[in-house]
Interface confidence: medium
């Protein structure tokens, strides 16, 4: 079952999954100037049995420079912020992760992948929080959040973490050294699908005359 929303946001903190439950997916995104290969997978899927889990499919990116319909654009301020705050980190692997049944490790990077990783989490997924560089953790309880199913709806538990502005960093479980994380959301951020009962789409149509026609593709 999909988690309907994102893990909670904690000011001056990022979250990270140490392992990904079976059913989790990672979008195959390519960095600017590259695109997925023709008939390439849209995503990787964590699958497996009781003894072994792994990521099905492989993400592959190829250069889109040869396309004459490609136009380079400057990201909007919102996009610039998003890319800045979701740059890829070195994978943080706790020592016992490989022995966690029904879970996959952090997928290895693929060539020319995007700086942002979008995951789709499933019920039972746990994420861990740490304060960003320059902030210190004050723990009132677990610095983690779990996606749970309650009365047919999914929700994330609230992590008990406060980050204060002192020059000291905390660590994810299993890490030997502190990781410097950019402020904002990490690469493991996901926006799972929201419930659809109050979601509507309307279309409007207009036929227009154009003398010069061009196609722009943002890849």
């Amino acid at each position: 079952e999909l988690c309907d929303d994102d893990p909670p946001e904690i000011p001056h903190a990022t979250f990270k999954a140490m392992a990904y439950k079976e059913g989790t997916m990672l979008n195959c995104e390519c960095k600017r100037g590259f695109r997925r290969i023709k008939s390439g997978s849209l995503y990787m899927l964590c699958t497996g049995n009781s003894s072994h889990s792994s990521w099905d499919n492989q993400c592959q990116c190829t250069s889109s420079a040869t396309r004459n319909t490609t136009k380079q654009v400057t990201p909007q301020p919102e996009e610039q912020k998003e890319r800045k705050t979701t740059e890829m980190q070195s994978p943080m692997q706790p020592v016992d992760q490989a022995s966690l049944p029904g879970h996959c490790r952090e997928p290895p990077p693929w060539e020319n992948e995007a700086t942002e990783r979008i995951y789709h989490f499933v019920v039972g997924q746990m994420v861990y929080y740490q304060c960003v560089q320059g902030y210190r953790a004050l723990h009132r309880g677990p610095a983690e959040s779990v996606c749970k199913m309650t009365h047919g709806k999914t929700r994330w538990t609230q992590p008990q973490l406060i980050c204060t502005g002192e020059m000291e960093t905390s660590q994810f479980p299993g890490e030997e050294k502190p990781q410097a994380s950019p402020e904002g959301r990490p690469e493991s951020e996901t926006s799972c699908l929201v419930t659809t009962t109050d979601f509507q789409i309307q279309t409007e149509m207009a036929a227009t005359m154009e003398t010069s026609i061009f196609t722009t593709e943002y890849q």
Epitope: L2, G40, L42, T47, I118, H120, L193
Partner: antibody
Framework: PSQTLSLTCAVS??????????WSWIRQPPGKGLEWIGY???????YYNPSLKSRVTISVDRSKNQFSLKLSSVTAADTAVYYC???????????WGQGTTVTVSS | DIVMTQTPSSLSASVGDRVAITCQAS??????VNWYQQKPGEAPRLLIY???TLQRGVPSRFSGSGSGTGFTLTINSLQPEDFATYFC?????????FGGGTRVDIK
């Protein structure tokens, strides 16, 4: 002169800027099956059906919470009902617009 | 492109019948298959995603199975509101492709 078809899909009940899904256009000629035109991520990245790619542009307007389709050089073969939809990747297209009937006549 | 071959193209059935619609993919697409129902004048409605997971709000008489290249949508105990056209769709690779559809009408 050639004509360009322009369709806009207004999204309510959620932000089009949220990550984790894409926004699709699909069409259905009268009495026929469904044909995927393309989709756009919230970031602006697009993927188009190769059969239509030279004529298609999909864009997103975050300020208006809507996304649009432009199909250039339309002919009678482009007559169809055009749908917009929210695509949850592996999880299917779970929210659809009501559809717009487009008739191209010579 | 991945071709989705859907059979039969049409079938006649009665209320209470068990109906099965199959979709064959031209290559291995794991479980990246979704099923939709469409009634005349309406937009398609997602029934099943990931080959076998029931979309929220969809009656449990609908079920999906299969993986790899062969997939089946089954309707147990057909109801009057189930007479419609059904489509399979692969979301493994772009371009995303649909089956040709199966029209289910009253016998």
């Amino acid at each position: 002169p050639s004509q360009t078809l322009s369709l806009t899909c207004a999204v309510s009940g959620g932000s089009i800027s949220s990550g984790g899904y894409s926004w699709s256009w699909i069409r259905q000629p009268p009495g026929k099956g469904l044909e995927w035109i393309g989709y756009i991520y919230h970031s602006g990245s697009t993927y188009y059906n190769p059969s239509l790619k030279s004529r298609v542009t999909i864009s997103v307007d975050r300020s208006k919470n809507q996304f649009s389709l432009k199909l250039s050089s339309v002919t009678a073969a482009d007559t169809a009902v055009y749908y917009c939809a929210r695509a949850g990747y592996y999880y299917g297209m779970d929210v659809w617009g009501q559809g717009t009937t487009v008739t191209v006549s010579s | 492109d991945i071709v989705m071959t859907q059979t039969p193209s049409s079938l006649s059935a009665s209320v209470g019948d068990r109906v099965a619609i199959t979709c064959q993919a031209s290559r291995n697409i794991w479980s990246y298959v979704n099923w939709y129902q469409q009634k005349p004048g309406e937009a398609p409605r997602l029934l099943i995603y990931g080959a076998s997971t029931l979309q929220r709000g969809v009656p449990s008489r609908f079920s999906g199975s299969g993986s790899g290249t062969g997939f089946t949508l089954t309707i147990n105990s057909l109801q009057p509101e189930d007479f419609a056209t059904y489509f399979c769709q692969q979301s493994h690779s772009t371009p995303i492709t649909f089956g040709g559809g199966t029209r289910v009408d009253i016998k």
